[in-house]
């Protein structure tokens, strides 16, 4: 037997203040024995990678032995709920999303590892995991509290060819600058090395006298 029931409105409870403790006791003790709603757990926050990929685990507490499970990812943003992707799988088998789906996933027992790809900053929002136990009956439905996925667009990378051109231009500029600098430096050095006295040669004595011979300095006149 499937599970469903209603609780009396607060305003109506005031009309029968004598009976409300019994009603409350009924809901607290009697109903949970016969009925366990399916709880779905998922992380509160996930940050998408720089490549726009976000992964999170969706775990459900199955009240029965389900063989066929349907998992749906909903997105809530700007007062709108949209279906991102959905997959039905047999327990023990892999999740199969549609070929054009942005979702992929794997299942392990009562856990579903979901991956959403191709996300951009504008896709930031609350991603809700909805789990339905399709077979065997009864049908059970559980909806998680949602995972807030934050997507930050990376800084746009310039074209690689453009980068190469910049690199080539900078290195060429540096090369020509260093070449020019070297040329200027060499020309200055050569100018500094020009002789001060033209046509005069002075023979200097050796530092250590050889065989007591002494040489007098002499001049060679230039005609």
């Amino acid at each position: 037997m499937a599970c469903l029931g209603f609780q009396r409105h607060k305003a109506q409870l005031n009309l029968a203040t004598r009976t409300w403790p019994c009603t409350l006791l009924f809901f607290l003790l009697f109903i949970p024995v016969f009925c366990k709603a399916m709880h779905v757990a998922q992380p509160a926050v996930v940050l998408a990678s720089s490549r726009g990929i976000a992964s999170f685990v969706c775990e459900y507490a199955s009240p029965g032995k389900a063989t066929e499970v349907r998992v749906t990812v909903l997105r809530q943003a700007d007062s709108q709920v949209t279906e991102v992707c959905a997959a039905t799988y047999m327990m023990g088998n892999e999740l199969t999303f549609l070929d054009d789906s942005i979702c992929t996933g794997t299942s392990s027992g009562n856990q579903v590892n979901l991956t959403i790809q191709g996300l951009r900053a504008m896709d930031t929002g609350l991603y809700i995991c909805k789990v339905e136990l399709m077979y065997p009956p009864p049908y059970y439905l559980g909806i998680g509290n949602g995972t807030q996925i934050y997507v930050i667009d990376p800084e746009p990378c310039p074209d690689s060819d453009f980068l190469l051109w910049i690199l080539a231009a900078v290195s060429s500029g540096l090369f020509f600058y260093s070449f020019l600098l070297t040329a200027v430096s060499l020309s200055k050095m050569l100018k500094k090395r020009s002789p001060l006295t033209t046509g005069v040669y002075v023979k200097m004595p050796p530092t250590e006298p050889e065989c007591e011979k002494q040489f007098q300095p002499y001049f060679i006149p230039i005609n």
Partner: nanobody, 130 residues
Framework: QIQLVESGGGSVQAGGSLRLSCAAS????????MAWFRQAPGKEREGVAT???????RYADSVKGRFTISTDSAKNTLYLQMNSLEPEDTAMYYC????????????????????????WGQGTQVTVSS
């Protein structure tokens, strides 16, 4: 399998009243959200009124002060009392139950909120003539 059966719809003159009922076939856990949705021809389904597990209610701006959502746990029934009906209220009215009360209040003024509700009735037609 949970079954929701609506009744109480019909044709009424503008300014008149109707009371919609939604009978449930079984009980559920304490955590849930009950709602009334409506869908006019050629329009999207919209949330009219919701009731949380603790009895908190919320209404669409267009029906505030005119419609009242309530329950009777003894009869396991959800109600929608509609007063001062207008021709714009003409639509198919659906009763729905969702498993997570977190989205109960958001079901109003949120497009696509029907995704949060897994159990639906077959609907009852309400026609308001001027």
């Amino acid at each position: 399998q949970i079954q929701l059966v609506e009744s109480g719809g019909g044709s009424v003159q503008a300014g008149g009243s109707l009371r919609l009922s939604c009978a449930a076939s079984a009980y559920t856990d304490r955590r849930y959200c009950m709602a009334w949705f409506r869908q006019a021809p050629g329009k999207e389904r919209e949330g009219v009124a919701t009731m949380d597990t603790d009895g908190s209610t919320r209404y669409a701006d267009s029906v505030k002060g005119r419609f009242t959502i309530s329950t009777d746990s003894a009869k396991n029934t959800l109600y929608l009392q509609m007063n001062s009906l207008e021709p714009e209220d003409t639509a198919m009215y659906y009763c729905a139950v969702g498993p997570n009360p977190r989205y109960c209040s958001g079901a109003i003024n949120t497009r696509g909120a029907e995704h949060y509700f897994g159990y639906w009735g077959q609907g009852t037609q309400v026609t308001v003539s001027s």
